[in-house]
């Protein structure tokens, strides 16, 4: 025999004191998929969480970070304060990147500059912190008499040494 | 820096009641939920509820949903905790705390003693 | 409710020593453990979240690791000032629950 609980869409439950009548979900709460016989409470994106997705009949809310924070964990059941640009988040909290290395991000590692030499390429723009290097053309593609750009030797940033 | 501020001890006759503040400074208070926690030797730590400062908005422990009430001030950046009807179960260390999925920042904890 | 259950309430060791303490969870928590640490004073100050991270100012003698329902706090180079009792903590569902605390002590 077939359960009628299994006819109730996503968006109701099977509402056993009604005869296992579908009944829609009550305000504040849904259901994801069919032949539920409860609905489930709304997650609610309070404090440091706010709300990226209302919730509906058949989904759960989402929510993210305030600004200053990012999300961690399945659902985002966490938040994280950011770090700033040319820092990265470590077990010690927010550093600043070491010399030759850069994060444009709030979020994420920071990454070596890229080589120019590996590509044949010159330096262009010096790498900081915050920016990659650009790489500008390689020497053979400057027109003859053209004075190549050359890499300058990578000069510390005033009060960044090294970690 | 981030900083709880929790008031002084309490020593309260069984049956009345208590309020307890929490005053928070270092950061925007209203951005994030305060919690409250009750700490006994026998129990432990206990999540009594929470608090959204923004809205108002409440979520309690059912077990603490009759003997707590949780209410914020945004003017002046403090969270209350009110216990009723007070008896020697309600002797404890009660800690507020701020929640980002964690709770990242600690009261200094206030001592109520329930005793005639 | 989602139980948390510290079974060693107290542990003695020797400074230098590696610690390791553990925590169970009553269902999946999805790595959402946090591990608290109070000092003799009351003080109450977090040391990780979301299992494996180490909160800002925290000694990188910490460090915390588990997934489903068993995780662990090991302190990997024992000192005095880790004189205390540790709380895991889940942030999965309400209510937030606690451990029952370890408590350690110097041998």
């Known amino acids: 025999l077939q359960d009628p609980c299994s006819n109730c869409p996503a968006g109701t439950f099977c509402d056993n004191n009604r005869n296992q009548i579908c009944s829609p979900c009550p305000p504040n709460s849904f259901s994801s998929a069919g032949g539920q016989r409860t609905c489930d409470i709304c997650r609610q994106c309070k404090g440091v969480f706010r709300t990226r997705k209302e919730c509906s009949s058949t989904s759960n809310a989402e929510c993210d970070c305030t600004p200053g924070f990012h999300c961690l964990g399945a659902g985002c059941s966490m938040c994280e304060q950011d770090c700033k640009q040319g820092q990265e988040l470590t077990k010690k909290g927010c550093k600043d990147c070491c010399f030759g290395t850069f994060n444009d991000q709030k979020r994420g590692i920071c990454r070596p500059w890229t080589n120019c030499s590996l590509d044949g390429k010159s330096v262009l723009v010096n790498g900081t912190k915050e920016r990659d290097v650009v790489c500008g053309p390689s020497p053979a593609d400057l027109s003859p008499g053209a004075s190549s750009v050359t890499p300058p030797a990578p000069a510390r940033e005033p009060g960044h040494s090294p970690q | 820096q981030v900083q709880l501020q929790q008031s002084g001890a309490e020593l309260v006759r069984p049956g009345a009641s208590v309020t307890l503040s929490c005053k928070a400074s270092?950061?925007?208070?209203?951005?994030?939920?305060m919690h409250w926690i009750k700490q006994t030797p026998v129990h432990g730590l206990g999540w009594i509820g929470a608090i959204d400062p923004k809205t108002g908005g409440t979520d309690y422990n059912q077990k603490f949903k009759d003997k707590a009430l949780l209410t914020a001030d945004k003017s002046s950046n403090t969270a209350y905790m009110e216990l009723r009807s007070l008896t020697s179960e309600d002797s404890a260390v009660y800690y507020c705390?701020?929640?980002?999925?964690?709770?990242?920042?600690w009261g200094t904890g206030t001592t109520v003693t329930v005793s005639s | 409710d989602i139980q948390m259950t510290q079974t060693t309430s107290s542990l003695s060791a020797s400074l230098g020593d590696r610690v390791t303490i553990s925590c169970r969870a009553s269902q999946d928590i999805r790595s959402n453990l946090n591990w608290y640490q109070q000092k003799p004073d009351g003080t109450v100050k977090l040391l990780i979240y979301y299992t494996s991270r180490l909160h800002s100012g925290v000694p990188s003698r910490f460090s915390g690791s588990g997934s489903g329902t068993d995780y662990s706090l090991t302190i990997s180079n024992l000192e005095q000032e880790d004189i205390a009792t540790y709380f895991c903590q889940q942030s999965e569902k309400l209510p937030r629950t606690f451990g029952g605390g370890t408590k350690l002590e110097i041998r």
């Open positions: 705390t701020r929640d980002l999925g964690y709770f990242d920042v």
């Open positions: 270092g950061y925007t208070f209203a951005g994030f939920e």
